[in-house]
């Protein structure tokens, strides 16, 4: 079987981590699209998506992951703001595509996410708590579940349950530095 | 509509084998991870082993690795559960269950009616 | 494994009145990524299988009666049937999904007082 890559990002708690999906422009664009985490011994998790059709630039939140589908560019954008020690695992961007399988985006991203230390970013837990907000015009949104081919363009989101957002903003162009490393499955 | 009957169940005597199938409809079959659940007599659920949608990975529970094997055949829309080594305790009502297309959940919308598994001498 | 412990075992409602089931997780079972709870609710009837009625801990499926809410995070969390109607009578179990194995409580028995 195919040896999947993996791009290795090492961050520290509070910080936020950045990366970018491409995919086929053309056979992809308005595709949906998500975010999974891949845990040992366990199947794919869906943790957000975008909507469907993905629009273009327009970001989706759930919980601390935003999401951004660059359709002029064949990107699709994850955030994972105010990382935890917990959130460290494998993740990959897939593209829903019902009802034929989620297609996969490659490299995978394995995140290990440490504690900070002492004026670093992270290091103090009450300062990261209230220090990310999603802009306004962020929709917050749930993957809706699909059920059949003959239901599936009328099936509208199962839900659009409360998805908190903490008060201060968040500066969308200063990502901390992270360090790539490749290295395979 | 959308439909999983399962198949196989029966008698069997300690150290034999069984096989169970489960036959899907109503959905794309191939898209979709599928799992069996089993319920013994007057008890609980317990989550038996998962397959995902083309079958190259497959998790099961510790009480029946290394003798169970769940397996499909996407051609013919059917969920397997190869049982061997059978023991008292696994009898049960074999379920399987196919969760959302998304796995966003990691619940079962759908459910078979089961098919009931007696192992005894 | 997660163990999933559910309370009471047994409960007797009379029709009309409040039923609440309570169910205990051995280690959180939300994702604090995405803020979701991976807890569901299900009701069985004798000599059927399970219906999902919860998930995400406080969503309903759709379908099910909205006198049927889930609440909680964390580790503790809790099914109300409102107003208790005599189709409720069922074994409700609670099941988590964050993580392999998936695992059940052992079930909670609702009956009309």
């Known amino acids: 079987a195919t040896k999947l890559t993996e791009e290795k990002y090492e961050l520290k708690e509070g910080q936020t981590l950045d990366v970018k999906c491409d995919y086929t422009l053309e056979k992809f664009a308005s595709s949906q699209k998500a975010w999974q985490i891949i845990r040992d011994g366990e199947m794919p998790k869906t943790l957000a998506c975008t909507e469907r059709p993905s629009k273009n630039s327009h970001p989706v939140q759930v919980g601390r992951i935003i999401l951004e589908d660059y359709h002029d560019h064949g990107l699709l954008r994850v955030r994972m703001v105010n990382l935890q020690v917990e959130d460290s695992g494998l993740y990959q961007c897939v593209i829903y595509q019902p009802p034929k399988e989620p297609h996969m985006l490659f490299d995978r991203i394995r995140l290990v996410v440490t504690k900070g230390f002492s004026g670093t970013p992270g290091s103090n837990e009450n300062s990261t708590q209230n220090v990310y907000k999603i802009p306004p015009t962020t929709t917050k949104a749930l993957c809706p579940l699909y059920t059949s081919p003959r239901t599936v363009t009328q099936a509208p989101p199962k839900s659009t349950a409360d998805v908190s957002t903490p008060d201060s903003e968040i500066n969308l162009t200063n990502v901390t530095d992270i360090i790539r490393v490749p290295v395979f499955n | 509509q959308v439909q999983l009957v399962e198949s196989g169940g029966g008698v069997v005597q300690p150290g034999r084998s069984l096989r169970l199938s489960c036959a899907a409809s109503g959905f794309t079959f191939s898209s979709y991870g599928m799992h069996w659940v089993r319920q013994a007599p007057g008890k609980g659920l317990e989550w038996v082993a998962v397959i995902s949608y083309d079958g190259s990975n497959k998790y099961y529970a510790d009480s029946v690795k290394g003798r169970f094997t769940i397996s499909r055949d996407n051609s013919k829309n059917t969920l397997y559960l190869q049982m061997n080594s059978l023991r008292a305790e696994d009898t049960a009502v074999y379920y399987c269950a196919r969760p959302d297309y998304y796995s966003s959940r990691g619940v079962f919308d759908i459910w078979g009616q089961g098919t009931m598994v007696t192992v005894s001498s | 494994d997660i163990v999933m412990t559910q309370s009471p075992d047994s409960l007797a409602v009379s029709l009309g009145e409040r039923a609440t089931i309570n169910c205990k997780s051995s280690?959180?079972?939300?994702?604090?990524?995405?803020?979701?709870?991976?807890l569901a609710w299900y009701q069985q009837k004798p000599g059927q299988p399970p219906k999902l009625l919860i998930y995400w801990a406080s969503t309903r499926e759709s379908g099910v009666p909205d006198r049927f809410s889930g609440s909680g995070s964390g580790t503790d969390f809790t099914l109300t049937i409102s107003s208790l109607q005599a189709e409720d009578v069922a074994v409700y179990y609670c099941q988590q999904s964050h993580s392999t194995p998936l695992t059940f409580g052992g079930g909670t028995k609702v009956e009309i007082k």
């Open positions: 280690q959180s079972v939300l994702y604090s990524s995405n803020n979701k709870n991976y």
